[in-house]
Interface confidence: low
């Protein structure tokens, strides 16, 4: 995208808006190192999942990939589903920017969204009946 | 705390900063539903993990919890580590706000950070030697 030189000073703190409203530079700093792609593992997960595209043009990031566990049980070493084990989602709360007011191109609000990142396998709760 | 009223209109688009710089309301919209707490499952994971606190006051969220797989193998139904299986991290790229310039209380930049959310179990790659 277009790079715009940044003023060395701070933006003016407008009386009515500071500190609730701040200025954010959308030119993303990317300090993350590439993760091992799920495709490297995906056929070998004991609790596999599929990824569903969740798109919302009023939000940044506009596309979020949501994991959905493929089975209720877990896949054993023979590749069969073991119903004595359970696939469960791993969820994380992430920050997104929600356009607000909706029609404004340059005004957003922070929003917390719960996303499912993947699935993992758990042993079931065993209740002994006395 | 003190709430500051929001202007119903859009902020002025300053030529030199728009569209790279936008205004963000930090009063978080929280539409997410509480996740099932890891503690509900943590003793039953086949690929358990511990959480490490990563704190940075220059960042929002200032505290990020990083998962670290507890074992290289996976825990079987008997509670023993099975070295024929592997615990692997599930990573996700998240957005955070980084204060920039550093000294400004009201100016931030979006940053992408890779975090490990949890661990899952995979069957190892089996290479047949012919």
């Amino acid at each position: 995208g277009i790079m715009i030189p940044q003023s060395p000073g701070c933006p003016k703190t407008e009386d009515k808006n500071f500190p609730q409203h701040v200025r954010v530079n959308l030119n993303i700093l990317n300090r993350s190192t590439p993760a091992r792609r799920p495709s490297d593992y995906s056929k070998r997960f004991t609790s596999p999942w599929t990824l569903q595209r969740n798109e919302d043009p009023e939000r940044y990031s506009s596309v979020i990939w949501e994991a959905k566990c493929s089975h209720s049980g877990c896949i054993n070493a023979e590749g069969k589903e073991d119903h004595h084990m359970n696939s469960v989602p791993i969820q994380q709360e992430i920050l997104v920017l929600r356009r607000e007011p909706r029609h404004c191109p340059n005004s957003f609000r922070l929003e917390k969204v719960m996303v499912t990142v993947g699935c993992t396998c758990v042993t079931p709760i065993v209740r002994h009946i006395s | 705390g003190i709430m500051i009223p929001q202007s119903p209109g859009c902020p002025k688009t300053e030529d030199k900063n728009f569209p790279q710089h936008v205004r963000v309301n930090l009063n978080i919209l929280n539409r997410s539903t509480p996740a099932r707490r890891p503690s509900d499952y943590s003793k039953r994971f086949t690929s358990p993990w511990t959480l490490q606190r990563n704190e940075d006051p220059e960042r929002y969220s200032s505290v990020i919890w990083e998962a670290k797989c507890s074992h290289s193998g996976c825990i079987n139904a008997e509670g023993k580590e099975d070295h024929h299986m592997n615990s692997v991290p599930i990573q996700q790229e998240i957005l955070v706000l980084r204060r920039e310039p550093r000294h400004c209380p009201n100016s931030f930049r979006l940053e992408k950070v890779m975090v490990t959310v949890g661990c899952t179990c995979v069957t190892p790659i089996v290479r047949h030697i012919s």
Epitope: - | G1, P57, E58, R102
Partner: nanobody
Framework: EVQLVESGGGLVQPGGSLRLSCAAS????????MYWVRQAPGKGLEWVAS????????YYVDSVKGRFTISRDNAKKSLFLQMNSLRAEDTAVYYC????????????WGQGTLVTVSS
């Protein structure tokens, strides 16, 4: 529990001086950038000055540059604002604030100290 207690405000004539102090407790003071923020009567908040964790750099809003000096004493967990050549427009409640991004609703701000500049 995080606590910030400001003192040193008062009534002063235009051109006069005041030194504001802020006593901090309940957190590792030396790990945080600190701010002075003010709220004039009937107005919102204005960031006045900030200082780096080790005191190596200071920053000021244009309207106070050359007149105000921010400083800190990490050993005593204290923040200061030396205000010289005071003007009527400096009349406000002055708050010290811990350099965390959120929460921004003054959970970690003091009760403030009132500075009145009037002849």
């Amino acid at each position: 529990e995080v606590q910030l207690v400001e003192s040193g405000g008062g009534l002063v004539q235009p051109g006069g001086s005041l030194r504001l102090s802020c006593a901090a407790s309940g957190f590792t003071f030396s790990s945080y950038r600190m701010y002075w923020v003010r709220q004039a009567p009937g107005k919102g908040l204005e960031w006045v000055a900030s200082i780096e964790q080790d005191g190596s750099e200071e920053y000021y809003v244009d309207s106070v540059k050359g007149r105000f000096t921010i400083s800190r004493d990490n050993a005593k967990k204290s923040l200061f604002l030396q205000m010289n050549s005071l003007r009527a427009e400096d009349t406000a409640v002055y708050y010290c604030a811990k350099g965390e991004i959120l929460p921004l609703y003054f959970d970690y701000w003091g009760q403030g100290t009132l500075v009145t500049v009037s002849s």
